[in-house]
């Protein structure tokens, strides 16, 4: 999906009002210096691409973040403010099997969510030059 035509300001507002708090809750008890940010993004569409990937694609050591509150809100925000996003995703996932895995917060998931926080911060400051 090409995130170029999203309403970035509305997505930013949803992040600031609610998604950010859920990310903080998920990370509670973790020091902010515990993980190094290794994932970056260059502009808002690129940031959303990376955010989508880290939020919804299973990775080694972190099977799924999709059950988390911040993930469900991210999915809804993208569906509301990115034209055609929900239709694209409906078609892409029609054949997905329904299975509910137990929620497990692993260190790898904490690291992944830390990366997500960095990507969201970058998304909110699009005019900053890439370091």
């Amino acid at each position: 999906y090409d995130f170029t035509n999203c309403d970035f300001e509305k997505i930013k507002a949803a992040y600031l009002s609610t998604i950010s708090k859920d990310l903080i809750t998920y990370m509670s008890g973790t020091k902010s210096t515990e993980f190094n940010n290794t994932v970056s993004c260059s502009n808002r569409p690129h940031c959303l691409t990376e955010i989508q990937s880290l939020t919804f694609n299973p990775t080694a050591g972190c099977a799924s973040l999709a059950k988390e509150m911040f993930a469900m809100k991210t999915k809804a925000a993208l569906a509301i403010w990115c034209p055609g996003y929900s239709e694209t995703q409906i078609n892409a996932t029609q054949a997905m099997k329904k299975r509910r895995k137990r929620k497990v917060t692993t260190n790898k998931c904490l690291e992944q969510v830390s990366q997500l926080q960095g990507l969201w911060r970058r998304f909110n400051r699009p005019l900053l030059k890439q370091q």
Epitope: F56, A66, K75, T93, M96, K98
Partner: nanobody, 118 residues
Framework: EVQLVESGGGLVQPGGSLRLSCAAS????????MGWFRQAPGKERELVSA???????LYADSVKGRFTISADNSKNTAYLQMNSLKPEDTAVYYC????????????WGQGTLVTVSS
């Protein structure tokens, strides 16, 4: 098995109100995000509102201030209160449950038709 059954659609005049209901079974609303999508003839399905288990909600600009999403966990039912209806709100409205298995995966109801016309 997840089941979502919508009701409350119908014909209403511009400026009128309707309340859509979505009776859910096979899961508890306590743990899932619920949404209302709509699809107008010849248009893509769009998410107009979503509600989360912490009580927070998101709304599309086109309905903000006119539509209110809510959930009664004791009845396992989600609602969409639609006020100040406009002809452009005419669509089939679908209740949806976040399937939480990844991007865009939802379980769907069969839909209920809302027609706004004088």
């Amino acid at each position: 098995e997840v089941q979502l059954v919508e009701s409350g659609g119908g014909l209403v005049q511009p400026g009128g109100s309707l309340r859509l209901s979505c009776a859910a079974s096979g899961f508890s609303l306590d743990y899932y995000a619920m949404g209302w999508f709509r699809q107008a003839p010849g248009k893509e399905r769009e998410l107009v509102s979503a509600i989360f288990s912490d009580g927070s909600a998101l709304y599309a600009d086109s309905v903000k201030g006119r539509f209110t999403i809510s959930a009664d966990n004791s009845k396992n039912t989600a609602y969409l209160q639609m006020n100040s209806l406009k002809p452009e709100d005419t669509a089939v409205y679908y209740c949806a449950k976040d399937r939480d298995t990844g991007i865009g995966a939802y379980d769907w109801g069969q839909g209920t038709l809302v027609t706004v016309s004088s």
